[in-house]
Amino acid sequence: PTDAPVSPTTLYVEDISEPPLHDFYCSRLLDLVFLLDGSSRLSEAEFEVLKAFVVDMMERLRISQKWVRVAVVEYHDGSHAYIGLKDRKRPSELRRIASQVKYAGSQVASTSEVLKYTLFQIFSKIDRPEASRITLLLMASQEPQRMSRNFVRYVQGLKKKKVIVIPVGIGPHANLKQIRLIEKQAPENKAFVLSSVDELEQQRDEIVSYLCDLAPEAPPPTLPPDMAQVTVGPGLLGVSTLGPKRNSMVL
């Protein structure tokens, strides 16, 4: 697996991250991995539509190290990570990187290899046990069976690590057998099967909503005593935590 060239880290204050771009906005504890099929089963123009879908989804997520962390991987016979879960960059910068994922147009896109990469590289160590872990597998092709030898092992390995796998089959060549096998492994592994990339936009909100519903809301922030706000009621001293209650999703 190869990684994208490292650019200087942009530090920013997470609490003053960029404002929501849409009414629908997912503010949950979530580690989300986008896996993009880099095979020639998608034309270069179709791959651009696929990337636009990923960017559109990212716009609807509260991306930060505290809320929704994202990773973006293009897969062919190997895997190329463009964004890692721990990358501390502004959401707009992450979206820009996602929009610049290169079209591989390879003969093979190995779902087994990218799930292995997800299992052993991305989720090798669970550093945010309180967050949901979801992999969105965008697949438009079929790998040779010999490459699929350990497919079920990797799907089961992800299940053991509580990683939900959501396959999105795109077009006539998507491997329906693998999609059904993923679904069979866990009830949360819901599949979306689309006839072409043109249907991605129609399904986007349903997919984001489904992902978001699987993730927990953040617990109310606990503050040290000196940060507490004293409220006086009739004949009663009370303590409440600062800050408004955060809604998980604004529709």
Epitope: S112, P144, Q145, R146, M147, S148, R149, N150, F151, V152, R153, K177, Q178, L181
Partner: antibody, heavy 122, light 107 residues
């Protein structure tokens, strides 16, 4: 019922190519793989390679440069070709069915042909 | 390649005996191990797959156990038709590899 039968010449000259055929019945060629295994006289089993239901292949690295496994679905036949043979290739050659299906990761050779003895000698 | 080592290479036993054959892998193979039985002049037959799952039609006197690198095939009460050579085979990593075999002979 599931059946596999190997056929081919029993005698091959050194440096020539050994060619065997495995004719199968009772199962779908796209749902199963077929493996080739050999057993030199009085010795143990050696895996040669396999062909998957979609025609993709895997070979034993020790034999890879000399082996070709292919399928003719219209005849329900699998073939093994081993080039540049020497006396060390003398063995009983078996073909066996492999549930080579990523929905089932138990890759066990559940049905075997009866085997065919190939002697390499001039 | 993963090396598979069986022990003993041969053993003598009587009908009714409990027989144990061990198989050791050169590296961790999880539970990805099969056992085959071969009689002289015949093709091997699958007995047990995935360490302990009995193949259809195989008598319940055969059982398998183990995980990682060490595995066992047990015949609880040896029958006359069980005199044969037994092979273990790993399928954790290609190429599939077999043990050298254990010959079970009549005492």
């Amino acid at each position: 019922q599931v059946q596999l039968q190997e056929s081919g010449p029993g005698l091959v000259k050194p440096s020539e190519t050994l060619s065997l055929t495995c004719t199968v019945s009772g199962f779908s060629l796209t749902d199963y793989g077929v493996d080739w295994i050999r057993q030199p006289p009085g010795k143990g089993l050696e895996w040669i390679g396999m062909i998957w239901g979609d025609g993709s292949t895997d070979y034993n690295s020790a034999l890879k440069s000399r082996v070709t496994i292919s399928v003719d679905t219209s005849k329900n036949q699998f073939s093994l070709k081993l080039s540049s043979v020497t006396a060390a290739d003398t063995a009983v050659y078996y073909c066996a069915r492999d549930p080579a299906d990523y929905g089932n990761y138990d890759y066990a050779l559940d049905y075997w042909g009866q085997g065919t003895l190939v002697t390499v000698s001039s | 390649d993963i090396q598979m080592t069986q022990s003993p290479s041969s053993l003598s036993a009587s009908v009714g005996d409990r027989v144990t054959i061990t198989c050791s892998a050169s590296q961790d193979i999880n539970k990805y191990l099969n056992w085959y039985q071969q009689k002289p002049g015949k093709a091997p037959k699958l007995l047990i797959y995935y360490t302990s799952s009995l193949h259809s039609g195989v008598p319940s006197r055969f059982s398998g156990s183990g995980s990682g690198t060490d595995f066992t095939l047990t015949i609880s009460s040896l029958q006359p038709e069980d005199f044969a050579t037994y092979y273990c085979q790993q399928y954790e990593k290609l190429p599939w590899t077999f043990g050298q075999g254990t010959k079970v002979e009549i005492k």
